[in-house]
């Protein structure tokens, strides 16, 4: 429950939230579990802690490992663990299962595909969407806030959808991609 799997691609931004939630006023300390070394909070570091968030800007394969977050209230300390895996970018179009977020289902009347983890990032529209690595074009596809809406959904719309956006941190831009499967169900 208080250990969460997170994954990302090398050279992309990855932001992880401490799985142990606390009130906004509580302080959070992050450590690299294997060495018990404290993660710095200074933003000049490629990997730094920012309250509930641990930021990899950008991520490297060597960043993989378990990170400990300790949330401190005035009287209680509670621990969470983030199990982070950074993968090398695939040269082909295939997105392996281990990079996939949860599958979503849609129907003719309801076909929203939410871009996974996007709420953790400082991004601005537009959000780019791809299906099986092809950029989506045509009036049936509408990128709305953090969703893709597909009009008049057909069974052929099933497949793997990737959202791509830019995270901005202190004027620097970092790419982020996330992929999930979409299935079409009968009404």
């Amino acid at each position: 429950k208080f250990s969460k799997q997170s994954w990302g691609l090398e050279n992309e931004a990855l932001i992880v939230r401490c799985p142990r939630q606390g009130k906004p006023s509580y302080t959070v300390d992050w450590y690299y579990s294997q060495t018990n070394k404290s993660i710095p909070t200074q933003e000049r570091n490629r990997v730094f802690a920012s309250g509930q968030l641990l930021k990899f800007l950008p991520a490297r394969v060597a960043d993989s490992g378990i990170y400990t977050c300790i949330v401190r209230s005035p009287t209680f300390n509670r621990t969470g663990y983030a199990n982070v895996t950074i993968y090398k970018k695939q040269s082909d179009c295939n997105v392996p299962d281990y990079l996939m977020y949860s599958t979503v289902s849609g129907s003719e009347k309801n076909s929203k595909i939410y871009c996974p983890t996007i709420d953790l990032y400082n991004w601005t529209a537009p959000l780019e969407w791809f299906k099986n690595c092809q950029a989506l074009q045509g009036s049936r596809y509408r990128a709305h806030k953090s969703f893709l809406v597909i009009d008049n959904v057909m069974t052929e719309d099933a497949g793997d959808y990737t959202c791509k956006f830019i995270h901005n941190e202190n004027g620097a831009n970092y790419s982020v991609t996330a992929t999930r499967s979409f299935t079409v169900k009968d009404e």
């Epitope: 939630q21 606390g22 209680f76």
Partner: antibody, heavy 123, light 107 residues
Framework: EVQLLESGGGLVQPGGSLRLSCAAS????????MIWVRQAPGKGLEWVSS????????YYADSVKGRFTISRDNSKNTLYLQMNSLRAEDTAVYYC????????????????WGQGTLVTVSS | EIVLTQSPATLSLSPGERATLSCRAS??????LAWYQQKPGQAPRLLIY???NRATGIPARFSGSGSGTDFTLTISSLEPEDFAVYYC?????????FGQGTKVEIK
């Protein structure tokens, strides 16, 4: 210093009503979830009801659902339990307590408790 | 609802002895388990949270362990003031539930 002080207990007939109050001091009442727990004479502890901080979402034990209502007045730093259709099995010491941590959708321990107020339901 | 079963119901020990109290959950509560101490005529007092962390001001002789469904509260060397009733409580989900209590009494 955190303090919780219950009041409003007493003797009531079956089917009657009672309103318990819990006056809180020594902490920022509005941001904490608050809980009522009861203890029948010589028995163990039973969670009765919880209320979120500023959001105000409420939760009830099945044994009191539809009969008891938990509420709070953050401007008065006071927690309430309105008890209707009281039964003999509601006889207990009622404690109010503070959840010092919980975030939306989660619960935590009870770090401060009042001294309790006795409710006796008997004809 | 998650049922917590404490054992034994009563533990008769002498001061200085080690007390081991058990709490078993009907389904996994991860580490969302607390222990309380209650003395006659008093409100419960929080001892342990998240299965193994001592609350502020609780002496080191109290320790908690376990995860999932099986938990233990250990008092390494009983002091006279430790004779009381001890309750476990889960907070992974509503309804919050307590065990029926273990009474630690003087032998």
């Amino acid at each position: 210093e955190v303090q919780l002080l219950e009041s409003g207990g007493g003797l009531v007939q079956p089917g009657g009503s009672l309103r318990l109050s819990c006056a809180a001091s020594g902490f920022t009442f509005s941001i904490y979830d608050m809980i009522w727990v009861r203890q029948a004479p010589g028995k163990g502890l039973e969670w009765v009801s919880s209320i979120r901080g500023e959001g105000g979402g409420t939760y009830y034990a099945d044994s009191v659902k539809g009969r008891f209502t938990i509420s709070r007045d953050n401007s008065k730093n006071t927690l309430y339990l309105q008890m209707n259709s009281l039964r003999a099995e509601d006889t207990a010491v009622y404690y109010c307590a503070r959840d010092p941590w919980s975030t939306e959708g989660s619960f935590f321990v009870l770090d401060y408790w009042g001294q309790g107020t006795l409710v006796t339901v008997s004809s | 609802e998650i049922v917590l079963t404490q054992s034994p119901a009563t533990l008769s020990l002498s001061p200085g002895e080690r007390a081991t109290l058990s709490c078993r959950a009907s389904q996994s509560v991860d580490d969302d388990l607390a222990w309380y101490q209650q003395k006659p005529g008093q409100a419960p007092r929080l001892l342990i949270y998240d299965a193994s962390n001592r609350a502020t001001g609780i002496p080191a002789r109290f320790s908690g362990s376990g995860s999932g469904t099986d938990f233990t509260l250990t008092i390494s060397s009983l002091e006279p003031e430790d004779f009381a009733v001890y309750y476990c409580q889960q907070y992974i989900t509503a309804p919050l539930t307590f065990g029926q209590g273990t009474k630690v009494e003087i032998k």
